[in-house]
């Protein structure tokens, strides 16, 4: 008996060939001997089976002695043995229809679980193997689970169902809803305008939800909500913004926030959360702000940074085109009685300068100028 595997919702073509290469009488029946379809001369006739309007044949092939049974929009319950009667002989074909579906939605939040469920006909014992877009293989039986979805899991999952040495392949498009970056850091000199961007790692036709940026300033004892906003069909509208600092928000995606100016009291970490309509859970992106200030008070030239810096970052004070006068893995450095000239305060990581602030030290009878 020939075995054919089909996919739920697809179309399958079961072949039946006569030895005579001409149009002769044929019938397709199911295992209950109920007629599905056949011919009467050049006309197609249909029986009382439940396939009825989903069953068809190719009249153009009859003259060549081919009498296929075409079943459209396959259902699991179409799994059966189909019998083709032609020239006093019977050809049996076993059709097994499988379905593979994602547990709920194919749009899942980062960190959520993906469960793929195999629908199979009674009596079958298939095995399933799925390959994720990043090349990870997962094997299972009737259900396959992947916990803690990551951004790289977005894309087409290819799943192969194996039964009776035959294979059928399913392709499922999974969209992992996440921000492009889990975390970002912005380095700014005091007084500069600060731009925060929160690009999404996915595109959908309509995007609706609400979001909020909570900010924990390094100097503050508790976090504070800086802005709340709504998202409707990719249009951003601000619901509430603190008076100080007064953030500005772009009206279109990607989510974009502007802090009027970098100040030591704003340095710290923020957490932008986005709750999407009809989704449980939230998307998160962490953002960090490091602020540098260089000042000269009396005979002391000081450079300070505020915000979340790593212990390996180096803070230096140097006179332009000269070696660093002071260089420390600390958040403040200073030089007593600095020479006149343009001093540079540098925040660097393994030699790469992240932030630079210049301050002009005038001869002792003058006051300093901040360019």
């Amino acid at each position: 008996k020939k075995v054919v595997l089909g996919k739920k919702g697809d179309t399958v073509e079961l072949t039946c060939t006569a030895s005579q290469k001409k149009s002769i009488q044929f019938h397709w029946k199911n295992s209950n001997q109920i007629k599905i379809l056949g011919n009467q001369g050049s006309f197609l006739t249909k029986g009382p089976s439940k396939l009825n309007d989903r069953a068809d044949s190719r009249r153009s092939l009859w003259d060549q002695g081919n009498f296929p049974l075409i079943i459209k929009n396959l259902k699991i319950e179409d799994s059966d043995t189909y019998i083709c009667e032609v020239e006093d002989q019977k050809e049996e074909v076993q059709l097994l229809v499988f379905g593979l579906t994602a547990n709920s939605d194919t749009h899942l939040l980062q960190g959520q679980s993906l469960t793929l469920t195999l629908e199979s006909p009674p009596g079958s014992s298939p095995s399933v193997q799925c390959r994720s877009p990043r090349g990870k293989n997962i094997q299972g039986g009737k259900t396959l689970s992947v916990s803690q979805l990551e951004l790289q899991d977005s894309g087409t999952w290819t799943c192969t169902v194996l039964q009776n040495q035959k294979k059928v392949e399913f392709k499922i498009d999974i969209v992992v809803l996440a921000f492009q970056k889990a975390s970002s850091i912005v380095y700014k000199k005091e007084g500069e305008q600060v731009e925060f961007s929160f690009p999404l790692a996915f595109t959908v036709e309509k995007l609706t939800g609400s979001g909020e940026l909570w900010w924990q300033a390094e100097r503050a004892s508790s976090s504070k909500s800086w802005i709340t906003f709504d998202l409707k069909n990719k249009e951003v509208s601000v619901k509430r913004v603190t008076q100080d600092p007064k953030l500005q928000m772009g009206k279109k995606l990607p989510l974009h926030l502007t802090l009027p100016q970098a100040l030591p009291q704003y340095a710290g970490s923020g957490n932008l959360t986005l709750a999407l309509e009809a989704k449980t859970g939230k998307l998160h992106q962490e953002v960090n702000l490091v602020v540098m200030r260089a000042t000269q008070l009396q005979k002391n030239l000081t450079c300070e940074v505020w915000g979340p810096t790593s212990p390996k970052l180096m803070l230096s004070l140097k006179l332009e085109n000269k070696e660093a006068k002071v260089s420390k893995r600390e958040k403040a450095v200073w030089v007593l009685n600095p020479e006149a000239g343009m001093w540079q305060c540098l925040l660097s990581d393994s030699g790469q300068v992240l932030l630079e602030s210049n301050i002009k030290v005038l001869p002792t009878w003058s006051t300093p100028v901040q360019p």
Epitope: E190, G191, E192, Q193, K224, S225, R240, V241, Q243, D244, P245, K246, T258, P260, Q261, A262, L263, P264, Q265
Partner: antibody
Framework: QVQLVQSGAEVKKPGASVKVSCKAS????????IHWVKQATGQGLEWIGE????????YSNAKFKDRVTITADKSTNTAYMELRSLRSDDTAVYFC???????????WGQGTLVTVSS | DIVLTQSPASLAVSPGQRATITCKAG??????????MNWYQQKPGQPPKLLIY???NLESGIPSRFSGSGSGTDFTLTINPVEENDTATYYC?????????FGQGTKVEIK
């Protein structure tokens, strides 16, 4: 101590412009937002707008938006409010103000009287 | 814009008595457990003076005779007991949303 000192009274003709200054001292000028408030004679208080002196980012009340420009000069610790196309109903005392530790305006300039008269 | 309506427009109180001024906001000025309402006192020829911020916090240097209460849309400034030099106009102001707005003022006279 924190002080905000404003420029002196001005008399202007309708259609002219006026630029009021507010010199700050006693704190780091770039650390705090400077606000401008209008008070017409015998009337209440009306918020005009604000400036972040460090970056120069300014925001203003839609009612004044087309006619007002708020600026700041870090080198002199001075904020400015310029009002153009003056009308008689612009005759008022204009105050600059700064927040304290809370959300209210704890520090105020002494006010500048602007008279618009033909 | 958030409209703030103060009542009464004027008030005459005897020294030692209690003076109560109310301020009603056109929409709630509450957020995250705080009420963004401030109160000021203004005497003729002077700039306003901050008395209360965030509905009930007394600004430093202000006598405890002044107190603020309320949340949402309804707020109250109480002066108890009133003293001679409390003669002034009192304003409420919301710092919840731009544009920042003030009440029309309440004139307090001491009998």
């Amino acid at each position: 101590q924190v002080q905000l000192v404003q420029s002196g009274a001005e008399v202007k003709k309708p259609g002219a412009s006026v630029k009021v200054s507010c010199k700050a001292s006693g704190y780091t000028f770039t650390d705090y937002v400077i606000h401008w408030v209008k008070q017409a004679t015998g009337q209440g208080l009306e918020w005009i707008g604000e400036i972040y002196p460090g970056s120069g980012s300014a925001y203003s009340n839609a009612k004044f938006k087309d006619r007002v420009t708020i600026t700041a000069d870090k080198s002199t610790n001075t904020a400015y409010m310029e009002l153009r196309s003056l009308r008689s109903d612009d005759t008022a005392v204009y105050f600059c103000a700064r927040r304290g530790n809370g959300t209210g305006f704890a520090y105020w300039g002494q006010g500048t009287l602007v008279t618009v008269s033909s | 814009d958030i409209v703030l309506t103060q009542s009464p427009a004027s008030l005459a109180v005897s020294p030692g008595q209690r003076a109560t001024i109310t301020c009603k906001a056109g929409q709630s000025v509450d957020y995250d457990g705080d009420s963004y309402m401030n109160w000021y006192q203004q005497k003729p020829g002077q700039p306003p003076k901050l008395l209360i911020y965030v509905a009930s916090n007394l600004e430093s240097g202000i006598p405890s005779r002044f107190s603020g209460s309320g949340s949402g849309t309804d707020f109250t400034l109480t002066i108890n007991p009133v003293e001679e030099n409390d003669t002034a106009t009192y304003y409420c102001q919301q710092s919840y949303k731009d544009p920042l707005t003030f009440g029309q003022g309440t004139k307090v006279e001491i009998k």
